[in-house]
């Protein structure tokens, strides 16, 4: 039985140019985390494997940065990364959870962070 | 230089069985999900069992399940696969591969030929 | 299971064409798709993974790109060891699915 919930950073916003800490969170359950891969819509951005560490797809290299932790760091942003992002939890003996975040990429220097909410 | 060697092939009689054995050197064979495919001849590509790292997790294609069983010995750097009530629709090239972040299957061995047949 | 459905079978080509092998999976796999090269005799060969990276050592007239449920493996100018056949593979779910192939022949 799956007992976890992913905490994500939720609705988020950030400038044009800039760049943005993508974090999900997995809690409520002793599960070992195996691996964590970030998509972006159908692309694959980047994998963190328990023992093979992180892997970041090569065309998303020279913008995207591993961590802090299982997260995932935007960097050099363009109004093109506007959009779903997901983080799926790939867990033993669980299987899998997965969040979701929305980020907007503004034209403006006003970019505020959404609440942080929770996918069971 | 990563290298997959794969043995135990050979002529087996319909219902009997067979343990393929699959040798890897060259890496971390402990980090790595592992994957048996096979080629019947003349045929294509057809995934047949995988397992995780830790051998927490194993999966089966439904033409295999509950008769071959995939495992591994990370202290040999070997991976296995017992293949039971052999068919003659089982009669393919078995081929080992690493599959990291189990996404995809990057280093292959050069294959086993099975051949079942009375 | 997710089938994978690959085309053409087959096809005729001269040294220098460009070749475009496609791939339709019977519902979304993300970018989860693999190519595979194989001669007779020999083992598949990874060329591309997750859609569209080039797997390390493949020459860089390999190229791969779509998602979602459609894809395509591109050789932009064939060259006399591309002779083979290729594979389409999903890694979404297991099962692991393969497409049929593609046997890329000489006109």
């Known amino acids: 039985m799956m007992t976890g919930t992913i905490e994500t950073t939720g609705n988020i916003s950030a400038e044009k140019g800039g760049s943005i800490i993508l974090q999900c969170h997995l809690s409520s359950t002793t599960a070992q985390v195996t691996q964590v891969n970030w998509e972006q819509q159908d692309q694959l951005l980047a994998i963190c494997n328990a023992d093979l560490g992180w892997h970041i797809s090569p065309s998303f290299k020279d913008r995207v940065a591993p961590g802090p932790g299982l997260g995932l760091t935007l960097q050099s942003l363009t109004v093109n990364d506007t959009g779903e992002y997901f983080c799926i939890y790939h867990t033993y003996p669980d299987g899998t959870y997965t969040g979701r975040i929305f980020l907007e990429v503004l034209e403006s220097s006003v970019a505020e962070h959404g609440a942080r909410f929770q996918i069971p | 230089e990563v290298q997959l060697l794969e043995s135990g092939g050979g002529l087996v009689q319909p219902g009997g069985s067979l343990r393929l054995s699959c040798a890897a050197s060259?890496?971390?064979?402990?980090?790595?999900?592992m994957h048996w495919v096979r080629q019947a001849p003349g045929k294509g590509l057809e995934w047949v069992a995988s397992?995780?790292?830790?051998?927490?997790?194993?999966y089966y294609a439904d033409s295999v399940k509950g008769r071959f069983t995939i495992s591994r010995d990370n202290s040999k750097n070997t991976l296995y696969l017992q293949m039971n009530s052999l068919r003659a629709e089982d009669t393919a090239v078995y081929y080992c591969?690493?599959?990291?972040?189990?996404?995809?299957?990057?280093?292959w061995g050069q294959g086993t030929l099975v051949t079942v047949s009375s | 299971d997710i089938q994978m459905t690959q085309s053409p079978s087959s096809l005729s080509a001269s040294v220098g064409d460009r070749v475009t092998i496609t791939c339709r999976a019977s519902?979304?796999?993300?970018?989860?798709l693999n190519w595979y090269q194989q001669k007779p005799g020999k083992a598949p060969k990874l060329l591309i993974y997750?859609?569209?990276s080039l797997q390390s050592g493949v020459p860089s007239r390999f190229s791969g790109s779509g998602s979602g449920t459609d894809f395509t493996l591109t050789i932009s100018s064939l060259q006399p060891e591309d002779f083979a056949t290729y594979y389409c593979?999903?890694?979404?779910?297991?099962?692991?699915?393969f497409g049929g192939g593609t046997k890329v022949e000489i006109k």
């Open positions: 591969a690493r599959g990291p972040y189990d996404v995809w299957l990057d280093y």
């Open positions: 060259g890496f971390t064979f402990s980090s790595y999900g």
């Open positions: 397992i995780k790292s830790s051998s927490s997790n194993k």
């Open positions: 519902q979304s796999i993300s970018s989860y």
């Open positions: 997750a859609a569209s």
């Open positions: 593979q999903q890694s979404y779910s297991t099962p692991l699915t």
